[in-house]
Amino acid sequence: DVSEYSCRELHFTRYVTDGPCRSAKPVTELVCSGQCGPARLLPNAIGRGKWWRPSGPDFRCIPDRYRAQRVQLLCPGGEAPRARKVRLVASCKCKRLTRFHNQS
């Protein structure tokens, strides 16, 4: 018996860049990682062995909610800071994969 695989929210910090300009502070967002279960022990159709693979609908750990955040971009040459809004992942969830979701 295999417990449900975890859909993890990993914190990732990065600077926002636009050409030669970079955000004054880094932004922290979530990266969705892990697998969604439960998984079952299913027969390997090719050989005699068995392997783990999810059965039924294909669920993926993908972004569930987003948030907006304004960043100030500092540019070389004394230009005034530019304002930019970025879309960041705010939470992750196991969701049924549809043809609209990126397969990667």
């Epitope: 909610r65 948030r67 907006a68 955040q69 304004r70 230009e79 530019r82 304002a83 970025v86 705010a90």
Partner: antibody, heavy 119, light 107 residues
Framework: EVQLQQSGPELVTPGASVKISCKAS????????MSWVKQSHGKSLEWIGD????????TYNQKFKGTATLTVDKSSSIAYMEIRGLTSEDSAVYYC????????????WGQGTLVTVSA | DVQMIQSPSSLSASLGDIVTMTCQAS??????LNWFQQKPGKAPKLLIY???NLEDGVPSRFSGSRYGTDFTLTISSLEDEDLATYFC?????????FGGGTKLEIK
């Protein structure tokens, strides 16, 4: 369908305060900043400031700092703008507008709220 | 603040005419600019974003272009329903600033 429904017209006396609302529907309220814009009669538009409903963080045009206060009620998806110490210069139509990241901010607007300041 | 100088403040044209109006930014090298149409008693409506991208549902007779800090809105063949005031907006620098508007009348 994205909709921004603003509160009705206000007639207020000089020195008083007014609080106008903007009820958002058709999208996740906390995903987008909400801006407020002033349009005096027959004049251009002025950006008052905006609020991030997710964090409550506000950014103001220096011109309106100290007179305008932006807040949100996340549970009911309503953005508010309060203006204090009203003068005749504050008589205008005020709009809320959803900010769509860098691509197309202000793609969705409320219908406007007319505020008249008169003794 | 970045000032957006819009011209002309008003113009009159005939149906079918090509109409152009401009906004010039007082400073800034990376202006993100939108164009709006506003009819009397109504809220502004987004026409063009990112200087030249047509918003969904906007007729293709509207187009936007940029040359340095000069931005142009062009209506290729004027129609009755285009009677309105047009505004530009820069949203790259705080505070966001609008142009003074161009009131378009039909001859």
């Amino acid at each position: 369908e994205v909709q921004l429904q603003q509160s009705g017209p206000e007639l207020v006396t000089p020195g008083a305060s007014v609080k106008i609302s903007c009820k958002a529907s058709g999208y996740t309220f906390t995903d987008h900043y909400m801006s407020w814009v002033k349009q005096s009669h027959g004049k251009s538009l002025e950006w008052i400031g905006d609020i991030n409903p997710y964090s409550g963080e506000t950014t103001y045009n220096q011109k309106f700092k100290g007179t305008a206060t932006l807040t949100v009620d996340k549970s009911s998806s309503i953005a508010y703008m309060e203006i204090r110490g009203l003068t005749s210069e504050d008589s205008a139509v005020y709009y809320c507008a959803r900010d769509d990241y860098d691509a197309s901010p202000f793609a969705y607007w409320g219908q406007g709220t007319l505020v008249t300041v008169s003794a | 603040d970045v000032q957006m100088i819009q011209s002309p403040s008003s113009l009159s044209a005939s149906l079918g005419d090509i109409v152009t109006m401009t906004c010039q930014a007082s400073q800034g090298t990376s202006i993100n600019l939108n164009w709006f149409q506003q009819k009397p008693g109504k809220a502004p409506k987004l026409l063009i974003y990112g200087s030249s991208n047509l918003e969904d549902g906007v007729p293709s007779r509207f187009s936007g272009s940029r040359y340095g800090t000069d931005f142009t809105l062009t209506i290729s063949s004027l129609e009755d329903e285009d009677l309105a005031t047009y505004f530009c907006l820069q949203h790259s620098y705080l505070p966001y600033t609008f142009g003074g508007g161009t009131k378009l009348e039909i001859k």
